[in-house]
């Protein structure tokens, strides 16, 4: 058994049939020893007496806020939640598992510069009875700060006969340095629970790793005289990191049919801007990818070409 | 969508024997504490026997203690009541109830979040 919080523990259990359970011994917060007791949750059966109470958790049922009294005066409160272990695995029932890049991605983070600031988000179906807390540090032995807001719902969407709720979070490196080769990684963990479950979710990253530009922003088209061609032309997004000339983007333009399957002419250049043949009801797409590290493509800026 | 399917009913005569099996699905099955009921022509429902989500705690109806076993298998998402030495007074529609985090002294059905379509018993003397 562990404290959470302030009065809020978290026993760990083995979850198969004939595991013996754990024992726990709780104990009344109070300077009075006499005329003490104990209750589970909104029941008012007295569970047993004196300053401390033994119980032998198995099961949820077992699990919940114990309060001490006296006199039908409240005393202490403590809250117990289950970790289950199944199959020497802890549960992972809370969040959806992504799939996105591997198999049990339960976390994903992306980061829209080196500036040290990063979101992470998760998904899950549950829609009631559920909080969130976030922690991060870059390293685990020696670590080094991390600040994380709260977690926040930031959208709902429906999947077949389920709704999918996803939670983000923002967190900021206190001392960044954005042109540092990284060494260690940033390590986030993320606390869930769910009424009397709780399960721990972790991920572990580098920066440099997680980078997903915004996509190129002022997108224009300037038509070339006597000519089907047009000169596309764009800036760096303002979330990029300066100076540009050091944290330089390469880029790639697309022309793109009505038709998906219309075949796509691309171009590729560390330029901010390009020369393609603009063709009828066509759309020409630029995205941008930091020059130097492959880490992930922004999403696509872009404009018709009538 | 949470799913709970009975079956094993039918006709017996008394002091035979049935086993009822109710499949879950749309539910983590093992956070879950599964309760059987039953409803007898013209009577309330009434509490049979509960099951906490490892197994390891259980809860009977005093009319039914040492007749009925209540067990689950966790890894086919299943509940099941084994009912010996049946009684005329055991003819119901059984109902299998699931509860998420409950307890097995649960015995009010509206403790109980989802419900099975109930399957018949009837036993003749």
């Known amino acids: 058994i562990w404290e959470l919080k302030k009065d809020v523990y978290v026993v760990e259990l083995d979850w198969y049939p004939d595991a013996p359970g754990e024992m726990v011994v709780l104990t009344c917060d109070t300077p009075e020893e006499d005329g003490i007791t104990w209750t589970l949750d909104q029941s008012s059966e007295v569970l047993g007496s004196g300053k401390t109470l033994t119980i032998q958790v198995k099961e949820f049922g077992d699990a919940g806020q114990y309060t001490c009294h006296k006199g039908g005066e409240v005393l202490s409160h403590s809250l117990l939640l289950l970790h289950k272990k199944e199959d020497g695995i802890w549960s992972t029932d809370i969040l959806k598992d992504q799939k996105e890049p591997k198999n049990k991605t339960f976390l994903r983070c992306e980061a829209k510069n080196y500036s040290g600031r990063f979101t992470c988000w998760w998904l899950t179906t549950i829609s009631t009875d559920l909080t969130f807390s976030v922690k991060s540090s870059r390293g685990s032995s020696d670590p080094q700060g991390v600040t994380c807001g709260a977690a926040t719902l930031s959208a709902e969407r429906v999947r077949g006969d389920n709704k999918e709720y996803e939670y983000s979070v923002e967190c900021q490196e206190d001392s960044a340095c954005p042109a540092a080769e990284e060494s260690l990684p940033i390590e986030v963990m993320v606390d869930a629970v769910h009424k009397l479950k709780y399960e721990n979710y972790t991920s572990s990253f580098f920066i440099r790793d997680i980078i997903k530009p915004d996509p190129p922003k002022n997108l224009q088209l300037k038509p070339l005289k006597n000519s089907r061609q047009v000169e596309v032309s764009w800036e760096y997004p303002d979330t990029w990191s300066t100076p540009h000339s050091y944290f330089s983007l390469t880029f790639c333009v697309q022309v793109q049919g009505k038709s998906k399957r219309e075949k796509k002419d691309r171009v590729f250049t560390d330029k901010t801007s390009a020369t393609v043949i603009c063709r009828k009801n066509a759309s020409i797409s630029v995205r941008a990818q930091d020059r130097y590290y492959s880490s992930s493509w922004s999403e696509w800026a872009s404009v018709p070409c009538s | 969508e949470v799913q709970l399917v009975e079956s094993g009913g039918g006709l017996v005569q008394a002091g035979g024997s049935l086993r009822l099996s109710c499949a879950a699905s749309g539910i983590i099955f093992s956070d879950n504490t599964m309760g059987w009921f039953r409803q007898a022509p013209g009577k309330e429902r009434e509490f049979v026997a509960a099951?906490?989500?490892?197994?390891?705690?259980?809860n009977y109806a005093d009319s039914v203690k040492g007749r009925f076993t209540i067990s689950r298998d966790n890894t086919k998402n299943t509940v099941y009541l084994q009912m010996n030495s049946l009684k005329p007074e055991d003819t119901a529609i059984y109902y299998c109830?699931?509860?998420?985090?409950?307890?097995?002294?649960?015995?009010?059905?509206?403790?109980?979040?989802?419900w099975g379509q109930g399957t018949q018993v009837t036993v003749s003397s």
């Open positions: 109830a699931a509860k998420p985090y409950g307890r097995v002294y649960y015995t009010e059905g509206s403790n109980y979040d989802y």
């Open positions: 099951i906490a989500g490892r197994g390891s705690r259980l």
